[in-house]
């Protein structure tokens, strides 16, 4: 990890494993103010290899909504519409943190978690030619 | 929100914004045990929109390291290695929540943050504007 | 119920030519692909060629390319095979087989299959 | 082409026992990879699809599992209706290949 100085302005950890739980602020700052969201929001459909959002919802977790891609076709899509047999629909997969309630159903107490997601498909082929 | 049923067991708030501000646990609980991180490693230079990842770094955000996808071509690549303008390659983005340390360089103290990633490119149909 | 009957089979010499179909019933044909799959006597599976639910793609293995044509009928659910320069090796049962989506990756439902002997 | 080595070509196994059949690809294929049945004088019946998905009315005692260039197909308790010839086939680059079959016999 990095060294971070401390500065004496920072609220005081009781916690004898400190800095293993910390105090967040779940106002949460919105950095992407200057981005308009909607302009990706019509690539899934016009797409090379084209997907569905599906919504995946949990309750116990912090991000509650989180919406996964699902290829819809094996193959990519041609100019024509149809599939091009020679290459693939592959997800594009990230992993993001998300705060997981810990104990169960506790509004306050939360355990940060790893997931992986599908976030959109892209369009690959299948061999790759290794050049002797 | 979803109103989630108080457990006798959660510790206590003492934070009269209560829920804004919630203790986190950092030990991260990883649910992608069963995915190989190494098979989607490739689709960057396989994929007809291929694309570069580039490292951003800040120590005061956690996870402190995050890539970023930059689109290779402004168009898509063709089966005989050529790139085709008729169709364009675009990032695909993600809002993710990251952890932003508040105040500055406090171990122990974060506020969450989102933020817009590329996480990798798909290749799309232009959109044609047909002029009456 | 799904049905899928193949039909057109038989004796043929080398160099000959036969139209195998394969008439589906029971499901919605032109919404799923479909494919023509063959096993030699005795031996193993081997794709002979796929078509997507409405017959713009298509694909052949080197094995049958330029001598073999899969097409479809959608409006009378019916899978065809053109096989023409018919070799001894081509001696097979011909499968019609049907892809669960739309362009025929692999397979939920098998005909009986049709027996081809080429032979002189 | 991707080559679909299947093992082994053939064996026997009593009743209630577990079966374990391997298929290994010439490349990484993805979890593309099917699983099927063929009953002498029958035509192929489709098990396992994406390397472990169970086909609907398929019984729980058929499994799949798997990654990159190797898989396995597994019958938990092998029943005497289980006798038939199994085989994988990757649908992951064109063109679509098979293994050369599992031969499964009672003892």
């Known amino acids: 990890g990095i060294a971070i100085p401390r500065n004496s302005g920072c609220p005081n950890s009781e916690d004898k494993n400190f800095p293993r739980t910390v105090m967040v602020n779940l106002n949460i700052h919105n950095r992407n103010t200057s981005t308009n969201p909607k302009r990706s929001s019509d690539y899934y459909n016009r797409s090379t290899s084209p997907w569905n959002l599906h919504r995946n919802e949990d309750p116990e977790r912090y991000p509650s909504v989180i919406w996964e891609a699902k290829c819809r076709h094996l193959g990519c899509v041609k100019a024509d519409g149809n599939v091009d047999y020679h290459m693939n629909s592959v997800p594009i997969q990230q992993e993001i943190l998300v705060l997981r309630r810990e104990p169960r159903h506790c509004p306050n107490s939360f355990r940060l978690e790893k997931i992986l997601v599908s976030v959109g498909c892209t369009c690959v082929t299948p061999i790759v030619h290794h050049v002797a | 929100g979803i109103a989630i049923p108080r457990n006798s067991g959660c510790p206590n708030s003492e934070d009269k914004n209560f829920p804004r501000t919630v203790m986190v646990n950092l030990n991260i609980h990883n649910r992608n045990t069963s995915t190989n991180p190494k098979r989607s490693s490739d689709y960057y230079n396989r994929s007809t929109s291929p694309w570069n990842l580039h490292r951003n770094e800040d120590p005061e955000r956690y996870p402190s390291v995050i890539w970023e996808a930059k689109c290779r071509h402004l168009g898509c690549v063709k089966a005989d290695g050529n790139v085709d303008y008729h169709m364009n390659s675009v990032p695909i983005q993600q809002e993710i929540l990251v952890l932003r340390r508040e105040p500055r360089h406090c171990p122990n103290s974060f506020r969450l943050e989102k933020i817009l990633v590329s996480v990798g490119c798909t290749c799309v149909t232009p959109i044609v504007h047909h002029v009456a | 119920e799904v049905q899928l009957v193949e039909s057109g089979g038989g004796l043929v010499q080398p160099g000959g030519s036969l139209r195998l179909s394969c008439a589906a019933s029971?499901?919605?044909?032109?919404?799923?692909?479909m494919s023509w799959v063959r096993q030699a006597p005795g031996k193993g599976l081997e794709l002979v060629s796929i078509?997507?639910?409405?017959?713009?793609?298509?694909f052949y293995p080197d094995s049958v390319k330029g001598r073999f044509t899969i097409s479809r009928d959608n409006s009378k659910n019916t899978l065809y095979l053109q096989m023409n320069s018919l070799r001894a090796e081509d001696t097979a049962v011909y499968y019609c087989?049907?892809?669960?989506?739309?362009?025929?990756?692999?397979?939920?439902?098998w005909g009986q299959g049709t027996l081809v002997t080429v032979s002189s | 082409d991707i080559q679909m080595t299947q093992s082994p070509s053939s064996l026997s196994a009593s009743v209630g026992d577990r079966v374990t059949i391997t298929c290994q690809a010439s490349?990484?294929?993805?979890?593309?990879l099917a699983w099927y049945q063929q009953k002498p004088g029958k035509a192929p019946k489709l098990l396992i699809s994406g390397a472990t998905s169970l086909e609907t009315g398929v019984p729980s005692r058929f499994s799949g599992s798997g990654s990159g260039t190797d898989y396995t197909f597994t019958i938990s308790s092998l029943q005497p209706e289980d006798i038939a010839t199994y085989y994988c086939?990757?649908?992951?680059?064109?063109?679509?290949?098979f293994g050369g079959g599992t031969k499964v016999e009672i003892k």
């Open positions: 078509i997507n639910h409405n017959g713009g793609s298509t």
């Open positions: 086939q990757q649908y992951w680059s064109v063109p679509w290949t």
């Open positions: 087989a049907r892809d669960p989506r739309h362009d025929g990756y692999f397979f939920d439902y």
């Open positions: 490349e990484d294929i993805y979890d593309r």
């Open positions: 029971g499901f919605t044909f032109s919404t799923y692909g």
